[in-house]
């Protein structure tokens, strides 16, 4: 059965860039290795941003990436990108493998709309 | 540019074994995951294996599963693949392909090499 | 496993026509994980359109892919001559990726 991937249409990133959102799929298929990966859709260019793999023992993702963090449970993983700016407003795509056992299935979802906008410098302060 | 060469291919005898061996170059061949297709003469395309950039997942056709081994060697760009107990049926042109990066579609074929399964 | 089937089997047609061809899965898949590929005589196959729509590098926009879920079509708008071959779909949403049986397109 294919699997549906459902993450939000628009996300506003803090003011600090750090931008999180969900990212779930369905139906919840009984995997031992789910591989997740974000990436960036710029005009018809699509570009990994961060991958990872999960696991029943490992929920905790993204380690070798500096800037994307995720936790996994179930068929849900909550997602982590920071330091972002303004030119990093974006689509941001999640797509999720089912890689264990066999068969592979793979579903993508619409994408998740992130605004960035940088904070406004500070103004001197006069003493 | 992508180059993809296969070799290996010949007549062999029913119930004996061949490997095939696809060679890469032009591209970071550690980075993608890589396909066998056969094509049966005057027939049409069945995907047969997939076996993912860094070798640790592998999917196949239930018709070669526990027959065909497909592996790869990534510090010498190349795809193999070992094909035991063969019979009349695996009779076909043998492609190796690449998975495009965001999808297993393939973007690049080599030219395929021929296996015949006689007697 | 999800089975492709494809019509028509045969399409003749004349150089300067357009050719619709389609293709139907036994069940729907994942974001439009289909692809189209062209194959000539004694060549290997070549990708045209991935994602039910998006063109591959190098490919002339006379061709072009739609569909979803589990009808797809694929449409030459002007048959040139290097376009008669045999057309095949093919899935990657789930494994095992499958390929329809082709359509031949001749000339008429």
């Known amino acids: 059965e294919a699997i549906q991937v459902t993450q939000p249409s628009v996300v506003l990133a803090s003011s600090h860039g750090v931008a999180s959102f969900p990212c779930e799929y369905s139906p919840s298929h009984n995997t031992d290795e789910v591989r997740v990966t974000v990436l960036r859709q710029t005009n018809d260019q699509m570009t990994e941003v961060c991958a990872t793999t999960f696991t029943e023992k490992n929920t905790v993702g993204f380690l070798d990436y500096p800037f994307c963090s995720g936790t996994f449970n179930e068929s849900r993983v909550n997602l982590t990108i920071q330091g972002l700016r303004a030119v990093d407003t974006g689509l941001y795509l999640c797509k999720v493998e089912l890689m264990y056992p066999p068969p592979y299935f793979v579903g993508m979802g619409n994408g998740t709309q992130i605004y960035v906008i940088d904070p406004e410098p500070c103004p001197d302060s006069d003493f | 540019q992508v180059q993809l060469v296969e070799s290996g291919g010949g007549v062999v005898q029913p119930g004996r074994s061949l490997r095939l061996s696809c060679a890469a170059s032009g591209f970071t061949f550690s980075s993608f995951g890589m396909h066998w297709v056969r094509q049966a003469p005057g027939k049409g395309l069945e995907w047969v294996a997939v076996i993912w950039y860094d070798g640790r997942n592998k999917y196949y056709v239930d018709s070669v599963k526990g027959r065909f081994t497909i592996s790869r060697d990534n510090s010498n760009n190349t795809l193999y693949l070992q094909m035991n107990s063969l019979r009349a049926e695996d009779t076909a042109v043998y492609y190796c392909a690449r998975g495009e990066f965001f999808g297993e579609f393939f973007d690049y074929w080599g030219q395929g090499t021929l296996v015949t399964v006689s007697s | 496993e999800i089975v492709l089937t494809q019509s028509p089997g045969t399409l003749s047609l004349s150089p300067g026509e357009g050719a619709t061809l389609s293709c139907r899965a036994s069940q729907s898949f994942s974001s439009n994980y289909l692809a189209w590929y062209q194959q000539k005589p004694g060549q290997a196959p070549r990708l045209l359109i991935y994602?039910?729509?998006s063109r591959a590098t190098g490919i002339p926009d006379r061709f072009s892919g739609s569909g979803s879920g589990t009808d797809f079509t694929l449409t030459i708008s002007r048959l040139e001559p290097e376009d008669f071959a045999v057309y095949y779909c093919q899935q990657y949403g789930t494994s095992p990726f499958t390929f329809g049986p082709g359509t031949k397109v001749d000339i008429k």
């Open positions: 994602g039910a729509s």
